[in-house]
Interface confidence: low
């Protein structure tokens, strides 16, 4: 779509005569008829295929034509077309004499024609005017013309439609060739796709307007590149949404169980070595000269029975001294001057000669030890008591004295808050670090399953991976209690299992 524009500039008819040679009376009141049509090698009569236009009376005999375009007038003349401009044309301009005010062809005298010119040729679309002048025997016409595209049409043939817009169809302006030029922040064939905030994660973020970064569920941060950990995750992180991967030394579903009591609390005294043995549980290995659960008690150096072969120990300021029985000598009475002939083996031990009778060795019966079978076996030397329990010898047997919160032969059992069956209506009891928790059967809720519920949000089995479902009465929604190894509001995400504990 475009417009052929014709600007009439000057018409000369000095003698004021018609084409027939007859003079106009009183002068030639001149108007023009213009015909624009397709290219013809010889411009012939026929329909004006590209359009026609007529002017009012512009002057008498010879006159210059005012440019009326700024005032909305008829010069330049406009010949619009709604097709692709072919690049060639034929133009016919007729000058006519109007004796009266009626300019209709049927109202004019038969010989009212003053002059007629016809041109044809090539014309490219452009802003520049082509100036031309046509002369006949009695008249001269000076004019210029051009072809320009209509609003919203572009290109060499005015065939490319482009209408700038900033709406759902697109966000663009038009280049001189009709191609789209996206407004800042938009992209795509029709400039309909917003350009998200720079760095916005391709998978985890999206945008509905430029420079925006909206996060998909499970992601957060300005660029949607930070995962959201499981709700309640205390000492843990995530690499995918709803995870809770525990920091070193922490365990449990929410990474809130202290597995590194030694590092976090340093309970062992006097340079003892601390070993973690479970949640909030540890064992201290004392340095020589110390004892107690936390190695807080100083030992007499004789408490370790350093004197052998029945030697007696005496504490001294700078250590200890062994008083050896007859037949023994050395720092710890470890050397013997006896042989099997001296019956050195006590408590039924049998004597075996060594080194041709210069020495001997005792083979001790059960429950006795020492080079002369003089010592009862101490069943506590192997530290059998767990969780900091104290080992006590009781004749032929031994027993463990447990720290508060532990029980069992070897203090290996955590004292259970669940022992008194506190959960009502068949609820399952779970020991926690700071108390207990009841998992209620369908239809019951409350801290001890004591409340009967009317709406069972768990009826649809919303929890995955054999998680326990229970109803939150305040919101009529369900909560999933995940087994170890799973997280998420429906326990749908697997995680690495935390270390197992000894209780």
């Amino acid at each position: 779509s475009g417009v052929f524009q014709l600007q009439l500039q000057e018409f000369i008819n000095e003698r004021g005569v018609l084409a027939s040679g007859r003079p106009c009376e009183p002068g030639c009141r001149t108007f023009f008829r213009v015909c624009l049509k397709h290219f013809q090698a010889v411009v012939s009569p026929g329909p004006c295929t590209f359009g026609t236009v007529s002017t009012p009376v512009l002057g008498t005999n010879s006159f210059a034509v005012r440019d009326d375009s700024s005032g909305g007038g008829r010069n330049p003349l406009q010949l619009p077309f709604n097709f692709t401009w072919p690049g060639t044309f034929s133009l016919i301009i007729e000058a006519w004499h109007a004796p009266g005010d009626d300019l209709r062809p049927e109202a004019l005298p038969p010989d009212a024609l003053i002059s007629k010119i016809a041109i044809q040729g090539s014309l490219a679309v452009g802003q520049n005017w082509l100036l031309d002048e046509q002369t006949s025997t009695l008249t001269r016409l000076r004019y210029s013309y051009r072809v320009i595209c209509s609003d919203n049409y572009y290109g060499d043939n005015c065939s490319r439609l482009c209408k700038k817009r900033n709406d759902h169809f697109g966000h663009y302006v038009c280049q001189p060739d009709g191609n789209l030029s996206c407004l800042p922040g938009w992209t795509g064939e029709y400039c309909q796709q917003p350009i998200c905030l720079s760095g916005c994660h391709e998978q985890n973020g999206y945008c509905s307007k430029p420079a925006e970064c909206l996060c998909r569920p499970g992601w957060q941060g300005r660029l949607c590149n930070e995962c959201i950990p499981h709700n309640g995750c205390r000492h843990g992180t995530c690499s995918t949404p709803w995870q809770c991967t525990c920091d070193e030394g922490w365990g449990g579903l929410f990474c809130d169980q202290d597995l590194n009591y030694c590092t976090h609390h340093s309970p062992c005294k006097n340079g003892a070595t601390c070993s973690n043995s479970g949640q909030r549980s540890y064992t201290c290995t004392c340095r020589p000269g110390y004892t107690g659960v936390d190695c807080e008690l100083e030992l007499s150096e004789c408490d370790s029975n350093p004197c052998r072969n029945g030697g007696s120990c005496k504490d001294q300021e700078d250590g200890y001294h062994c008083l050896c029985p007859p037949g023994y000598y050395g720092l710890h009475c470890e050397h013997s001057t006896l042989s099997c002939a001296d019956s050195p083996c006590f408590n039924g031990g049998s004597c075996r000669e060594r080194n041709q009778g210069a020495n001997y060795a005792c083979e001790c019966p059960p429950n006795f030890t020492g080079s002369n079978c003089e010592k009862k076996v101490d069943r506590c030397t192997s530290n059998p008591c767990a969780n900091g329990g104290q080992c006590l010898n009781r004749g032929p047997s031994r027993m463990c004295r447990c720290r508060p919160g532990f029980t069992g032969t070897y203090c290996e059992l955590h004292v259970s808050d669940c022992a008194r069956n506190p959960c009502a209506h068949g609820g399952t009891c779970h020991d926690l670090e700071n108390g207990l928790m009841c998992t209620c059967p369908a239809g019951f809720s409350g801290r001890r399953c004591e409340v009967r519920t009317s709406i069972d949000a768990c009826a649809s089995s919303p929890c995955f991976n054999r998680a326990t479902c229970y109803t939150d009465l305040s919101t009529d929604t369900f909560v999933c209690n995940c087994p170890y190894g799973f997280v998420g509001s429906r326990c749908e995400f697997p995680v690495g299992l935390p270390p197992s504990f000894p209780w």
Partner: antibody, heavy 117, light 107 residues
Framework: EVQLVQSGGGLVQPGGSLRLSCAAS????????MHWVRQTIGKGLEWVSA???????YYPGSVKGRFTISRENAKNSLFLQMNSLRAGDTAVYYC???????????WGQGTPVTVSS | DIRLTQSPSSVSASVGDRVTITCRTS??????LAWYQQKPGKAPNLLIY???SLQSGVPSRFSGSGSGTDFTLTISSLQPEDFATYYC?????????FGQGTKVEIK
Amino acid sequence: EVQLVQSGGGLVQPGGSLRLSCAASGFTFSMYDMHWVRQTIGKGLEWVSAIGTAGDTYYPGSVKGRFTISRENAKNSLFLQMNSLRAGDTAVYYCVRSGTTEWFDPWGQGTPVTVSS
Amino acid sequence: DIRLTQSPSSVSASVGDRVTITCRTSQGISSWLAWYQQKPGKAPNLLIYAASSLQSGVPSRFSGSGSGTDFTLTISSLQPEDFATYYCLQANSFPYTFGQGTKVEIK
């Protein structure tokens, strides 16, 4: 009552051409964007082309260069010229109006196009 | 092109049931989504536009929700005349695209 009445469907051989028409009534046709949508057994509903109030046209890649949408506001008419037809163009074609909020409503009654040798 | 994925592809339900159909888009489209109902041999009929706006003349048992990439059509109490195929349409950007359809059948 707003109405869209379609015509011009039928059987055509592969590589052939067909022109679909849609006559609008009950509303000021020149003020609305118009669309063609087709429905195939295999691919379901598929948008084929659109023409704006200023005559601006839009096509998906599957028909670009083969289909031409046009309108004649003076006659309240919408057209779809389909050239170089393929078997995959076999469908029921609907002409659809959309207004300032860009929602497809109402739809014509549909016209079947079968491309087969 | 923006892809639309409807689920489920079909659902069997009884009169009075609550039926929910979801439509997920491959990229964010704000609220520029519509829902259509189509019965055999008929043209599609607009139910919901702009994700949640009820088209004039459509019963209030139909409702829509969602924005961005996840959208839902809900029929609160299924009526005999509601057994049909339902389509979602994104009108955010060219080319406009439809979901593959969800058929609601009588159980």
